[in-house]
Structures are given as C-alpha cells and as structure tokens.
C-alpha cells in the first residue's frame, strides 16, 4: 500500500489534467480526491501517465467503490482498465454496449483474455441476454470472443441471433460450447436449401448429433476434412464406411493424412479392415477379418 | 519408403502382346486401389485402367476396353496389366500408380513400343 | 467422357511473381479435382485435392479454387523448384480424365 502522507497545500488538485504527471506516487494518493477522480474519468486516458501512476489510480478508484465501480467509471477507463484483474470485473454490472467496445478497443494487442471474458460475462448478465446488438458488437470487436463465454451464457443465445455469427468466430469453441450453438444454428437454418444450409451450418456442426452427421452424409455436402476433424468423437464413431465415403465425397482423399488424429484414428478402430479397404486409401487399423465384435456396454447394462 | 517399380516393356510388331507388372513396396499393397497410366511421345497423361483394393473391381478406358486386363496379386505384392491386340497408338510410357481418385505415388514408368 | 481444357498451356514467369493456371471440365464435376506437378524425368506429385485442400506438405503458396466447371491453381510467389508442367485431373467420373497441361517456365 501506498504511505499515507498529507499533501502539501501547492499541490492540492481541483481538476484532473495533464500537471498529474510530474506527482509522485505518494503525492497522487495524498493530493487525488477519488470523488474528483470518478467524476472527471473521461480525462484519465488523454493523459500520459505511467505505469506506476495508473496504480494508485485504481487504488483509489478501489477505496471508493469496494462493491465494483459504476458504469460511469468502467466506460471512461480507458488503459487504466489494463490494471484491471478478473476479480475487480466480475464485481461490474455493465450494459451499456458502448462501454465494452470502448474496453475492447483499449484491451486490444494485450494478453487480457481472462479479463476481457469476464467484460462480456458481465455485459450479457447485465443485458439479461446475449442478443443481436451484442453478438454483432463482439464479431466487430473482438473476433473469437464469442467462445470465451460459458456454455450457461451462450444458452441465452435467440437462433434468430445465430446468423450474425461468422465462421471465424466459433474458430476457438469447445465441444460443450458447440453443443449449446449448434441446435440453435440448425433452428435458425432450417428453412434454407441443402448447399446453403450446409454453408451455414458447417462452423457449429462440432456440436451436431450422430443422427444430423448421418443425414448430411445423404446430401453430397462434400464435407471438408477440416470441419470433418472438427465433429464430435461421439458423432463420427457409429458411421460406417458408406456414409463417411458419402459425406466427405472428393475430401475422402485426404483421410489417409488424418489417419492417426481423432476422431479418424477412432472410426478406423470401428471398422472393420475389409470395409476400410473398400476405400482403397491404405487405411490401417481396423477390425481384422474373422473377428467378432462384442458390444460389452449393452452385457454391462443389462446385467 | 512407398516404391513402385514397372517392367515387362519392350518393342512389339502390332497385334501382339506384353503383360506389364508393378512392383510394389514399403506399404500394405492390398488396401489400396491401383491405376495404369500412360504418356504417348510428346502428348499428356492418360489414364488406362483402375483396380480395387481386392481385384473384384475393374474399370477401362474405352480404348484400350477388350484389349488389355488390369490384375493383382495381393500375395505378392505386384499389380499386372495385360496388353493384347495392341496398336502403334498404345506407344507410351506406362506407368503404375495408388490411389483411389488421386495418383499419390507413380512408378518411374516402362516404354512400350508398338513398330513393325 | 469429361473433358479437361488447361489455360494456357505454357507461359513464363519470374521468380517472386503471382501465377494462375485455369482448367475447365466440359460438364459439372463439383470439387472432384486435383492438380498435379510434374517436373522433368519425375513423377507426377499431387498439390491440391478436392479443388482447393492442399495435399500434407505442399507449400502454402499453393492453392486452389472453383466448382462446378471452372478451377484455378494460384502460386503466389513463385519459387525456382516451381518451374514444371502443372496438370489438372478430374475423378468425379471414369475415365479419369486429365487436362492437356501447362507448361511454367522461366521468363
């Protein structure tokens, strides 16, 4: 903690403006009213303050909203919002979308991505919803960050919303994230033709059922391998050989490269050798002719 | 290291007869679909004829459908192709290559020239 | 049978230029086309599969685009070991059928 020290009459401050720099660390904290501070915010970022400076800042800032800081602050905090942990964050009620885009903009070219999750953790809580103006807001500002949020956060997500969301913005989602998105991306699509729908369903198909995989397999989609490595391990085990040949058409090609990456090294442990050479791609690992497979799972549940 | 190894060409008067073989080595031969292609003097690449993995499947080009037989023998490793009835236009330079659509690996081809 | 018509058949270019070499199927062949490279006295190597994935180990400068009837191989920088006879070939059907290739040389 800063010393506690009095502050000298000459340097007591009325406003808040650019003779700041020239304090010490221990003058700031004896000369800076936080109430003036708060107030005069939308000036802190014009000014060039170190590193050093900027903590005694939020030390201050600190003192005078123990509970979290009001939207009125969080908006003006410009690089001060650098100094900000998790913790501090997660204590904010954030609405407004202009307060997030100015916090983006600032956070931007910094490793913040725990805190920047947390900024939009608080703005859909605060929002009541993740909805369109927000969605498009995080697409425009901070590509990827659509996947920073809980999968409980996405659930709040309208289908009617799904369409605004670019491929590149489910680029770093989880297969639990995936799993909330992708039925309603299948709502949100349903109505479209087969070629079209598969273009826009594709990014969320991570988080698509064995069943919806199969049927897609019906459609000559020529799945690519990319997004067919992307599918959930669950999904592409029960597909036979048929249907995997069916759904990548011209990408089946590229299976032998994948051969030892799941979920392909998985799916040729299913199958067995005589199917997968049908393929006539050299794939290696099934089932050898003459064996029996025993699904033990069904003994187990049964017994 | 995948090696694919052809032989069997030669000189040949027309009407007559050669039974090319590949020889294949460094992977599992059998769960692989193999191609027969060729290259005329100075023309492109030309495709002869494919067979599955187990020899049950068998597709030509019409020009050479009647006249030449694509074969394998899993046991050994060697995938054949019979040429019978053949013409000066068969003159090229065969090749064997894998894959199932897309040639991965080529041999280093065997002439075949059809002159009386 | 699905013809293959390669444009243009040779052209030159220099080290560092962007090069484009086009194939068109007489009928639709959607994305069941694959480009090759070959380089005198050597085998054919396949670049791109499947109109636009780049085969494992082919250099990124590479790349492929179109469906349908219309496909372009792209090298964006050409490097020296990239002056060859380039070859398009479609299997969406048999006969497998090959384009009459284009020849990339030195300018």
């Known amino acids: 903690d800063v010393e506690r020290t009095t502050c000298p009459p000459e340097k007591e401050v009325h406003e808040i403006d650019e003779s700041l720099i020239f304090y010490k660390k221990r003058e700031l904290e004896a000369c800076v009213d936080a109430a003036l501070l708060a107030a005069q915010m939308d000036r802190v970022d014009a000014i060039p303050f170190t590193y050093e400076q900027l903590d005694v800042l939020k030390h201050k800032l600190d003192e005078l909203y123990p509970q979290g800081y009001p939207e009125s602050v969080i908006r003006h905090l410009g690089h001060l919002f650098l100094k900000m942990s998790p913790e501090d964050i997660r204590k904010w009620n954030v609405t407004s979308l202009e307060t997030l885009k100015a916090l983006l903009k600032v956070s931007k070219g910094h490793e913040m991505s725990a805190q920047v999750a947390t900024l939009i953790d608080r703005v859909v809580v605060g929002r009541g919803q993740l909805d369109k103006d927000t969605v498009d807001t995080l697409t425009a500002f901070c590509p990827g960050c659509l996947c920073s949020l809980s999968p409980e956060r996405l659930s709040s997500v309208p289908p009617s919303v799904i369409g605004a969301v670019r491929p590149q913005d489910l680029d770093t989602c989880g297969p639990r994230q995936l799993d909330v998105l992708y039925p309603k991306a299948r709502l949100a699509f349903q109505n479209m033709s087969g070629s079209e729908y598969f273009v826009k369903i594709r990014p969320f198909l991570g988080g698509a059922p064995t069943e919806d995989v199969k049927a897609l397999s019906q459609q000559n989609v020529s799945m690519d391998l990319a997004t067919f490595m992307k599918l959930r391990r669950e999904a592409v085990l029960p597909l036979t050989v048929a249907e995997v040949q069916k759904l990548l058409g011209p990408h089946v090609e590229g299976l032998k490269v994948e051969e030892q990456h799941s979920p392909v090294r998985d799916w040729i442990l299913k199958q067995r050798q005589d199917d997968l050479d049908t393929l006539g791609l050299g794939l290696q690992g099934g089932i050898p002719n003459g064996y029996l497979i025993l699904d033990l799972s069904v003994r187990e549940a049964l017994s | 290291e995948v090696q694919l190894v052809e032989s069997g060409g030669g000189l040949v008067q027309p009407g007559g007869s050669l039974r090319l073989s590949c020889a294949a080595t460094g992977f599992t031969f059998s769960s692989y679909w193999m191609h027969w292609v060729r290259q005329g003097p100075g023309k492109g690449l030309v495709w002869v004829s494919r067979i599955n993995s187990d020899g049950t499947s068998t597709v030509y080009a019409d020009s050479v459908k009647g006249r030449f037989t694509i074969s394998r023998d899993n046991a050994k490793n060697t995938l054949h192709l019979q040429m019978n009835s053949l013409r000066a236009e068969d003159t090229a330079v065969y090749y064997c290559?894998?894959?199932?659509?897309?040639?991965?690996?080529w041999g280093q081809g065997t002439l075949v020239t059809v002159s009386s | 049978d699905i013809q293959m018509t390669q444009s243009p058949s040779s052209l030159s270019a220099s080290v560092g230029d962007r090069v484009t070499i086009t194939c068109r199927a007489s009928q639709d062949i959607g994305s069941w086309l694959t480009w090759y490279q070959r380089k005198p006295e050597k085998a054919p190597k396949s670049l791109i599969y499947a109109a636009s994935s780049l085969q494992s180990g082919v250099p990124s400068r590479f790349s492929g685009s179109g469906s349908g009837t219309d496909f372009t191989l792209t090298i964006s920088s050409l490097q020296p070991e990239d002056f060859a006879t380039y070859y398009c070939?479609?299997?969406?059907?048999?006969?497998?059928?090959f384009g009459q290739g284009a020849k990339l040389e030195i300018k």
């Open positions: 290559a894998r894959g199932r659509g897309i040639m991965t690996y």
């Open positions: 070939q479609q299997y969406k059907s048999y006969p497998l059928t």
